[in-house]
């Protein structure tokens, strides 16, 4: 079969970590240094891709499969495959076009990457404020006001139940 | 340019073992990827097994589990160790590295 099959097309068989050449009449030849095929069948090896300048390689380059590449420390990963990196803030801080900037007012991140998000709209869910928010938190939220007023049973209600589709904050 | 010799073909029955040697002289310093092809007459030129640029060794399906390609820098020589050999393994077979090929040496197995 194998050989049937090399009469129709012989760059079939080629394996990956190897390339069918066009220069030697279509025989399978492995890939050249720093270069990689992945898959069989190739007609060309890829060049390796190489981690410079703010990346780093977290994984070598193999004839059969590509270098990876991350960050180095103060920059994360954007992009399919680490395709560029982004500049660390502080939690608390946004990434802006002038750099990193603290977080506006009723605004948190609690991470080092991404933009700032408002804080959660306690009374939206019909509850109050238990903890205020800060640059770096969400506020958190606590019963309903109409919980805490004088005469309130201390056992909590079950909550209503809510519409298929929502869920809770 | 390298110059590659192989030798250890023979005649041997199915399921006996060869050991080919390939020895490399000259500018064996640009060697980084080595080979083993095989061919029959009339027969395109096929891979078998083969060192690659990050020394790590490959085989083609059909010498999976059977042959076993190995390198020794010391003695500038590649080896290719042919086990459980079958009829059909019946070939001549060539090193290769680069444009250097060596001039064959002849694999029969019959019973």
């Known amino acids: 079969f194998e050989r049937t099959r090399s009469l129709q097309d012989p760059c079939s068989n080629c394996p990956a970590g190897t390339f069918c050449d066009n220069n030697r009449n279509q025989i399978c030849s492995p890939c050249p240094p720093n270069s990689f095929s992945s898959a069989g069948g190739q007609r060309t090896c890829d060049i390796c891709r190489q981690c410079k300048g703010v990346f780093r390689t977290r994984k070598e380059c193999s004839s059969t499969s590509n270098a990876e590449c991350d960050c180095t420390p103060g920059f994360h990963c954007l992009g399919a495959g680490c395709s560029m990196c982004e500049q660390d803030c502080k939690q608390g801080q946004e990434l802006t076009k002038k750099g990193c900037k603290d977080c506006c007012f009723g605004t948190f991140n609690d991470q080092k990457r991404g933009i700032c998000r408002p804080w959660t709209n306690c009374s939206l869910d019909g509850k109050s404020v238990l903890v205020n928010g800060t640059k770096e938190r969400d506020v958190v939220c606590g019963p309903s006001p109409a919980d805490l007023s004088p005469g309130a049973s201390s056992v909590t209600p079950p909550a209503p139940a809510r519409e298929p589709g929502h869920s809770p904050q | 340019a390298v110059q590659l010799v192989e030798s250890g073909g023979g005649l041997v029955q199915p399921g006996g073992s060869l050991r080919l040697s390939c020895a490399a002289s000259?500018?064996?310093?640009?060697?980084?990827?080595i080979s083993w092809y095989r061919q029959g007459p009339g027969k395109q030129r096929e891979l078998v097994a083969w060192?690659?640029?990050?020394?790590?060794?490959h085989y083609v399906d059909s010498a999976k589990g059977r042959f076993t390609i190995s390198r020794d820098n010391t003695k500038k020589t590649t080896y290719l160790q042919m086990n459980s050999l079958k009829l059909e393994d019946t070939d001549v077979y060539y090193c290769n590295s680069g444009d250097s090929w060596g001039q064959g040496t002849q694999v029969t197995v019959s019973s």
């Open positions: 060192i690659a640029w990050d020394n790590i060794a």
């Open positions: 000259g500018n064996i310093s640009s060697i980084r990827v």
